[in-house]
Interface confidence: low
């Protein structure tokens, strides 16, 4: 139904705390650079105009579109091109172009330090002494830092956040109860920012269609005792919110959410037997915990999928009426039969499915040539499953420190021209997998596994995208979403590379790193680890774990000595010449 | 740390050419953008042209079709070709490079004066 005031509408369905929330998650993922202070002036004065439609919905400039409202905020800041440089130039543009340069402007990796925790005391004091500014100042940080941060989950993180300090900012050791659990917190929004920004990926490269053919998989394999209009329901409303919060329209977004969660909870009956528990909860808590609710049970009676897409011999009939329904009830059928495969290997097997259906309905005995279809499914599934076999008896082996190190050696191999920041970030995260997936059931690891990798190597091709250095990565990050992680996995060492030149600085240390936290020490050493790699593509495992090993063990003596510089003065350029020689 | 340092100002005459380069002292992996500004005499710093990594370019409107922006991979260089010139092009020029890894870099300026 249409509003005569927009911003109106949406100020009433929210709420003034999450409307002003959103607005500044809105604010803070369009211009990254500016403080929390101008920020939060800006949402205070949409959220007084807002209120003022509220009062008035015919009151001056209260049918303006959100868009149109936002957009003429941001484009008023002073300083805007000296701050934004050629993002001043999107204020030039009319609705809607105007949104879209500002969305093509947003950063992915902008240039901001680590969001650093503050100290417990100091915390737990800004936060008693205002909540809601200690609060806004968190959904400023991350959405800045995370550009496509699904708005509304961040509102979640920041409740988990504001009940976790009021928790523990009462406790005697403040310390100890807050440390784990803000790094739970952390944690779990960081793998929630680069699925999202997945999403987005699908949505942007290959629209709608894409993320709903994943949406289909998802909710197939979560609520497989739904038919399939209802997954096709939730699908469509699905899309329909992630490309509202893709696009920034983060209020349409929220509120979207809220009206699906609130369908969902309303027709448990047609959907799953699992949605009590989430719907008894309040507003953010239920919708989050809706996205990942656990499987609900597979029916028992299920026939083999073979009767109606490859005995049937009405297949091409059925496949020419209407492609798009056929491949989507395939795509349902096989998704809820297999909740133990990635939504990315269901979208590979329903894409081959398509391609066979493609040729063999155009030749002239279709059936027997589409008859061999699931014979041919076998290597596709058996591939991922042996991905997740070597690498989680591998992280078994080594513990994840090592495990990222195998990851690490083995992409820098695969593409030594990506800077060694970009792949040890890369390494490390990829590397995290084994923690997060390897201690799961059997049943769910290659979901785990291959998802979330998958989402991390869409960053490594959006940071890739705008140094492009490596035509293994190139060629990688173009095609589907759905084949990029195989096509990495299938990388081998990049012949074309010309090695690095050993510079003994790059293996430079100092007592300086001795000082520094467990992270950044590991960070260091793979930085340095990535160098050899550079150095001697083609080192064996051997040689380097010979390097590495005598690395560490020069850190731990010069880091115990009584006088730690010259330890490293006079045992570094002798660890150099040892690192050469034991790779010549 | 990595500098960036322009070249290839002077005066010219109306209607003259000039080739600004702007090099960086060492390679930069992590480039996503560069540009050139200006900045003239009493005005604010203001954007002449930027080109990404993928080569695709854009200008302001008051020097379309008049100067073009390049850059050599190979040499690290960013360039700017300046035909037609005119006494309003006059002002210090400046290459800034946006980074994915790092803050973004400017280079120190090279003037232009254009004599009518």
């Known amino acids: 139904e249409a509003h005569k005031s927009e911003i109106a509408h949406r100020y009433n369905d929210l709420g003034e705390q999450h409307f002003k929330g959103l607005v500044l998650i809105a604010f803070s993922q369009y211009l990254q650079k500016c403080s929390y202070d101008e920020h939060a002036k800006l949402v205070q004065e949409v959220t007084d105009f807002a209120k003022t439609c509220v009062a008035d919905e015919s009151a001056a400039n209260c049918d303006k579109s959100l868009h149109t409202l936002f957009g003429d905020k941001l484009c008023a800041i002073p300083n805007l091109r000296e701050n934004y440089g050629e993002l001043a130039d999107c204020c030039t543009k009319q609705e809607p172009e105007r949104n879209e340069c500002f969305l093509q402007h947003k950063d992915d990796n902008p240039s901001l330090p680590p969001f650093e925790r503050p100290e417990a005391e100091a915390m737990c004091t800004s936060f008693k002494e205002n909540p809601t500014t200690f609060m806004g100042h968190y959904l400023h940080e991350v959405a800045r830092r995370h550009p496509y941060f699904y708005a509304p989950e961040l509102l979640y993180y920041a409740e988990q956040y504001n009940e976790i300090l009021t928790q523990c900012c009462a406790e005697a050791d403040k310390e100890s109860c807050l440390t784990p659990k803000l790094d739970g917190v952390k944690e779990k929004a960081l793998v929630s920012s680069v699925r999202q920004r997945m999403k987005c990926s699908s949505m942007q490269k290959f629209g709608e269609r894409a993320f709903k053919a994943w949406a289909v998989a998802r909710l197939s394999q979560t609520f497989p005792n739904a038919d399939f209009a209802e997954i096709t329901k939730l699908a469509t409303d699905l899309t329909k919110v992630n490309k509202e919060c893709c696009h920034g329209d983060l209020l349409e977004c929220a509120d979207d959410r809220a009206e699906l969660a609130k369908y969902m909870c309303e027709n448990q009956a047609t959907i799953s037997s699992k949605l009590q528990t989430c719907c008894d909860k309040p507003l953010l808590k239920k919708a989050h915990c809706l996205s990942e609710v656990e499987h609900d049970t597979m029916p028992a009676d299920l026939p083999a999928i073979a009767a109606d897409f490859v005995e049937d011999q009405e297949v091409c009939k059925n496949y020419a009426e209407a492609k798009d329904v056929f491949l989507g009830t395939f795509l349902y059928e096989y998704s809820r039969r297999h909740p133990d495969y990635s939504v990315s290997l269901l979208l590979r097997l329903a894409k081959k499915y398509e391609a066979t259906l493609e040729k063999c309905c155009a030749e002239a005995n279709p059936p027997a040539c589409y008859g061999t279809v699931l014979a041919e499914f076998q290597p596709l599934v058996e591939e991922p499953k042996n991905l997740v076999k070597t690498n989680c008896d591998l992280y078994e082996k080594l513990g994840e420190y090592g495990f990222q190190n195998a990851i690490l050696v083995r992409y820098t191999q695969k593409a030594p021209q990506v800077s060694t920041p970009t792949l040890v970030e890369a390494a490390r995260n990829l590397g995290r997998v084994g923690t997060k997936c390897c201690t799961l059931p059997e049943d769910q690891r290659l979901p785990c596994v291959e998802d979330y990798l998958s989402a991390i190597l869409n960053r490594v091709c959006l940071l890739h995208e705008k140094t492009p250095v490596s035509e293994h990565v190139t060629k990688c990050c173009s095609g589907s979403l759905v084949e990029r992680r195989p096509c990495f996995s299938a990388l081998t060492v990049d012949e074309t590379y010309v090695p690095k030149e050993f510079k003994a600085e790059t293996f430079t240390f100092h007592s300086d790193i001795c000082t520094l936290p467990e992270k950044e020490k590991q960070i260091k050493k793979q930085t340095a680890l990535a160098e050899l790699v550079k150095h001697k593509p083609k080192a064996t495992a051997e040689q380097l774990k010979t390097v590495m090993d005598d690395f560490a063990q020069f850190l731990d003596t010069c880091c115990k000595a009584a006088d730690k510089d010259t330890c490293f003065s006079t045992e570094g350029p002798n660890l150099v010449t040892r690192c050469k020689d034991a790779l010549a | 740390e990595v500098q960036l340092v322009e070249s290839g100002g002077g005066l010219v005459q109306e209607g003259g050419s000039l080739r600004l380069a702007c090099a960086a002292s060492?390679?930069?992996?992590?480039?996503?953008?560069l540009g050139w500004y200006r900045q003239g005499p009493g005005n604010e710093r203001e954007l002449v042209a930027t080109?990404?990594?993928?080569?695709?370019?854009s200008y302001a409107d008051s020097v379309k079709g008049r100067f073009t922006i390049s850059r050599d991979y190979d040499k690290n260089t960013l360039y700017l070709q300046m035909n037609s010139l005119r006494p309003e092009d006059t002002g210090l020029y400046y290459c800034?490079?946006?980074?994915?890894?790092?803050?973004?870099?400017w280079g120190q300026g090279t003037q232009v004066t254009v004599s009518s």
């Open positions: 080109i990404t990594v993928g080569d695709s370019t």
């Open positions: 800034k490079i946006r980074r994915t890894w790092h803050s973004e870099l």
């Open positions: 060492e390679r930069i992996w992590d480039i996503n953008l």
